[in-house]
């Protein structure tokens, strides 16, 4: 298993991840956003709601 070197993003990237934590993937030369629950997108810019359907009659 290849090891990935990671560190925190530089201050230069402040504000890059809108709703998440910015991680610098050193060997891949890129920043990565670890999104908070409920957010998605490269920069955690999209909010999504998980809609739970009520059980249908045949399951009651």
């Amino acid at each position: 298993v290849a090891q990935v070197s990671i560190t925190k993003c530089s201050s230069d990237m402040n504000g890059y991840c809108l709703h998440g934590q910015c991680i610098y993937l050193v060997d891949m030369s890129q920043n990565y956003c670890r999104c908070e629950v409920g957010y998605t997108g490269v920069r955690c810019e999209h909010f999504f709601l998980t809609v739970h359907q009520p059980l249908s009659k045949e399951y009651v």
Epitope: D12, S29, Q30, R43
Partner: antibody
């Protein structure tokens, strides 16, 4: 593959303005920051500023504040750098540079010549 | 603003020589430094980022080291194709380039 294609060379008179475009293909500029760097003939590299195309936030070097405007049009996936009140010392190659999802991916450069 | 002082501004060395370039930051840049090579008429080429991480396709004779405010770029054995100008770039807080080092063959 990913590309940053800049507009062609420009010749401008002192006091005029120039607007250089930087069109991205292969990626969405909203996932990146777009930086602008210039290089005068025989001189070093000079960082001018950047834009966050997702929200339009900009940062400028104090030296250029008030004279440079960086914008982005996310509908066309294009960033722009406008420099006003041009003087001969602004003669340079201007580069747009992508950062964020990939470390510093450069456009081909645009030569701006300021001459009376 | 963070200032980057790069030295020397130029150097002349023989093929096979070890070449060292230094960059000193005006404050701690937490290893967020990159090194570029630029040949006449070309856009800069990224060689190293995050102090010592070599980019794909970059020969292993290029290396970088340092921490805090002091950083070093080394060519272990200078080759004719290495003739270029080299720049450091800090990207800890916004961005600042060093003044550049022109490398020539003796």
């Amino acid at each position: 593959q990913d590309q940053l294609v800049q507009s062609g060379a420009e010749v401008k008179k002192p006091g005029a303005s120039v607007k250089v475009s930087c069109k991205a293909s292969g990626f969405n500029i909203k996932a990146t920051y777009i930086q602008w760097v210039r290089q005068a003939p025989g001189q070093g590299l000079e960082w001018m500023g950047r834009i966050d195309p997702l929200n339009g936030n900009t940062k400028y070097v104090p030296k250029f504040q008030g004279r440079v405007t960086i914008t982005a049009d996310t509908s066309t996936n294009t960033a722009y750098m406008e420099l006003s009140s041009l003087r001969s010392e602004d003669t340079a190659v201007y580069y747009c540079v992508r950062s964020g999802t990939l470390f510093d991916f450069w456009g081909q450069g645009t030569l701006v010549t300021v001459s009376s | 603003d963070i200032q980057m002082t790069q030295s020397p501004s130029s150097l002349s060395a023989s093929v096979g020589d070890r070449v060292t370039i230094t960059c000193k930051a005006s404050q701690d840049i937490h290893k967020y430094i990159a090194w570029y090579q630029q040949k006449p008429g070309q856009a800069p080429r990224l060689l190293i980022q995050y102090t010592s991480t070599l980019q794909p396709g970059v020969p292993s004779r290029f290396s970088g080291s340092g921490s805090g405010t002091d950083y070093t770029f080394t060519i272990s054995s200078l080759q004719p194709e290495d003739i270029a100008t080299y720049y450091c770039l800090q990207y800890d807080n916004l961005r600042t380039f060093g003044g550049g080092t022109k490398v020539e063959i003796k």
